[in-house]
């Protein structure tokens, strides 16, 4: 349905509050270094213009596309070239190239300070001007996460508001707020990683890959839904994410609301778990649907072999309609296996396709493809045994040392990667242990490998910006489903020339003593990565000894009266003994 004025259409559909929030998020994701006040000014101007168009759709410029209107607005920023350099060149281009240009300049790792909770100041700001306070939150998250799922960020802003509403009147604001904000931050990071994987999948593997991923995941969640129903939701959901990944946040939010409405209207034929979601207001409803637990499997699901291994007509069906046939296989296999990860299901479907390609060219295809299901066994066993091995290690050593083991492992695989990136990825992978290893057996594999996919995508995104390893580029770009096995297969990089030893890399000062625990850990883990870069062939025992000595040294000096003197005196001794231990 075409509208005379696209901006009026979206303003009317979304309402002023959501319209303003989404425009603020979109602008903050494009111009990540601009001050909040500058964005507020731009958003207010756009909103006033939208109101004018809503009142009269044939008013001047109201017929222009959103990309044209928003791009023109962004290009009015006076300091564009000074602040962003070549991003300013985008403004020389015409749509749609101009928007594509803006997208390529989004920075996944902007140089922005960590946000520290300051309960007293924040409560004062919240009470003085709640709208400005929440706008600032949208801005701060959006500029740090330029691919954050726009409508979902509006939901998180409501959670943020609820936290301050509850905690600001409390006697101990700090005790009330800190755990809530920490938990929200974890949810934000997870949500950001999920959407970044979707956007990366569009960028690197195309729409078909995103659809295949969604067919597998939604078939797991909605095993009672028929294939046509799953396909409809997948098609609509793919459009929603494509729009958000392209910066079209208003269309994305509007289409997401339509999809939530459709799902709730058809919940009887989709899932019994949707009832609680569908009674909620829009933002909560959409969030709830996205996070809904997997429905119970229908009791009467027949075995798959009859239709996909024993049927004499398989090659005919495959030849007639490859996409439909393989889509059906992926749907049927996935709905029966909530205990598998999405990438495992995609690897199984890929193996099935390869088998049919081979068998359907042979003299007796049915004899050839009859045993196809046997080929899935090693595909399933490999990640299962990996999860068991890693969870055993996690349970034995705890999160911090599990992170250290992963930092060592990944530094050996890719010692050219920057230390901050290796530490970030290792820490994230380590947290997967805490999240997934405590779950029942049937949930460990999907939890682990699905979260691993998010962490490895972060590595791929950061590596794409500054490529340093051909092996990583290959794992990141060859196949979405094979990423994790590809990284698992990487060994010590034999071609790597060890980094020369620099004492200052391992020099600590008294400032470490006052750091929060996680930042203390990061300092020590950075030293660990540097040790591996210096001695890639060091054994686990050697590294464990040296890291233990470092921890003891930090604890000892932080307990002293004259901390800095202790660091200055004991530090060089530690560095020397560490070199000896690693020789």
């Amino acid at each position: 349905d075409t509208h005379k004025s696209e901006i009026a259409h979206r303003f009317n559909d979304l309402g002023e509050k959501h319209f303003k929030g989404l425009v603020l998020v979109a602008f903050s994701q494009y111009l990540q270094q601009c001050p909040f006040e500058d964005h507020v000014k731009l958003v207010n101007e756009v909103t006033e213009f939208a109101k004018k168009c809503a009142a009269d759709e044939s008013a001047e410029n109201c017929d222009k596309s959103l990309h044209t209107l928003f791009g023109d607005k962004l290009c009015t920023v006076a300091t564009l070239r000074a602040t962003y350099g070549e991003l300013a060149d985008c403004c020389e281009k015409q749509e749609p190239e101009r928007n594509e240009c803006f997208l390529t300049h989004k920075d996944d790792h902007p140089n922005l300070p960590k946000l520290k909770p300051e309960p007293d100041a924040q409560c004062a700001a919240f009470q003085e001007d709640p709208d400005k306070f929440l706008g600032k939150y949208l801005y701060e998250v959006a500029r740090r996460h330029p691919y954050f799922y726009g409508p979902e960020l509006l939901f998180h802003a409501e959670e943020y508001k609820a936290d301050f509403t509850e905690c600001c009147p409390a006697d101990d604001k700090l005790a009330c707020l800190i755990p809530k904000l920490d938990a929200l931050k974890e949810r934000i990071l997870l949500s950001s990683a999920k959407e970044r994987l979707k956007c990366s999948s569009f960028q690197n593997f195309g729409e078909r890959a995103v659809k295949a991923w969604s067919v597998a995941r939604l078939s797991q969640k909605f095993p009672k839904a028929d294939f046509a129903e799953v396909s409809k939701i997948v098609t609509d959901l793919t459009k929603v994410h494509k729009e958000c990944c392209h910066g079209d946040l208003l269309e994305c939010a509007d289409d997401r609301a339509d999809l939530a409405k459709y799902i709730c209207e058809h919940q009887d034929s989709i899932s019994g778990k949707l009832k609680a979601c569908c009674d909620k207001p829009l933002l909560q409803k959409s969030h709830c649907i996205a996070e809904v637990k997997e429905d119970d499997l229908p009791s009467d699901l027949p075995a798959l072999a009859a239709d996909f291994a024993e049927d004499k007509e398989i090659c005919k069906h495959y030849k007639d309609a490859k996409d439909v046939f393989l889509g059906t296989f992926l749907y049927e296999y996935s709905r029966r296996h909530p205990d598998y990860s999405v990438s495992l299901l995609l690897r199984i479907a890929k193996t099935y396709e390869a088998t049919l390609e081979k068998c359907c060219a042979e003299a007796d295809p049915p004899a050839c493809y009859r045993t196809v299901f046997d080929q899935f066994t090693p595909l399933v066993e490999e990640p299962k045994s990996l999860v068991k091995k890693n969870c055993d290690l996690f349970e034995e050593v705890g999160e911090y040392d599990f992170q250290n083991a992963l930092i060592v492992r990944y530094t050996k695989k890719a010692p050219q990667v920057s230390t901050p990136t290796l530490v970030e990825i290792g820490r994230t992978l380590g947290k997967v242990g805490s999240r997934c290893c405590k779950l029942p057996e049937s949930e460990r594999l999907p939890c682990s490998e699905n979260h691993l996919a998010l962490a490895l995508n972060r590595l791929c995104v950061l590596h794409e910006k500054t490529p340093v390893s051909e092996k990583i580029t290959k794992c990141c770009t060859d196949s979405l489903a094979e990423r994790r096995p590809c990284f698992s297969a990487l060994e010590l990089d034999e071609g790597y020339v060890p980094k020369e030893f620099k004492a200052e890399t391992f020099t600590f000062h008294a400032d470490i003593c006052t750091l929060p625990e996680d930042e203390k850990q990061i300092k020590k883990q950075s030293a660990l990565a540097e040790l591996v870069k210096h001695k890639p062939k060091a054994t686990k025992e050697q590294l464990k000894t040296v890291l233990g000595n470092f921890s003891a040294f930090v604890a000892k000096c932080c307990g002293r009266e004259d901390k800095e003197a202790c660091f200055a005196e004991e530090g060089p001794k530690l560095v020397a003994s560490s070199q000896l231990a690693l020789a």
Epitope: D226, F227, T328
Partner: nanobody, 125 residues
């Protein structure tokens, strides 16, 4: 019991268009798919496409994708197959069929419970 009545078909030049229709009567239930199949002389029945009665989602065979389009008119309990850019190899008897959407093997004739009588489509070069 569902009865399926077909109309349309006939003779057309290569590159031309035809529209087939299939009207359902009787106890028609939701979660139903309507499939189109065709059978050329001496060949097996071949999947053409399928449309979901509930949500209008369509799937097509590789040989007709981009040329044929299915649609539905819920009030009239009718589905249509619009065939454009016809080729001589599209010549066949075209059948519509109704089945339960839950079986998911929409490409397989054996999964459909009710069939129309068929209508001849001939594409001359």
């Amino acid at each position: 019991q569902v009865q399926l009545q077909q109309s349309g078909g006939g003779l057309v030049q290569a590159g031309g268009s035809l529209r087939l229709s299939c009207a359902a009567s009787g106890r028609f239930f939701s979660r139903q798919v309507m499939g189109w199949f065709r059978q050329a002389p001496g060949k097996d029945r071949e999947f053409v496409g399928v449309i979901s009665w509930d949500n209008g989602v369509t799937f097509y065979s590789d040989s007709v994708k981009g040329r044929f389009t299915m649609s539905r008119e819920i009030a009239k309990k009718t589905v249509h197959l619009q065939m454009n850019s016809l080729k001589p190899e599209d010549t066949a008897v075209y059948y519509c069929a109704a089945g339960n959407a839950l079986h998911s093997r929409y490409y397989s004739p054996s999964k459909y419970d009710y069939w129309g009588p068929g209508t001849q489509v001939t594409v001359s070069s």
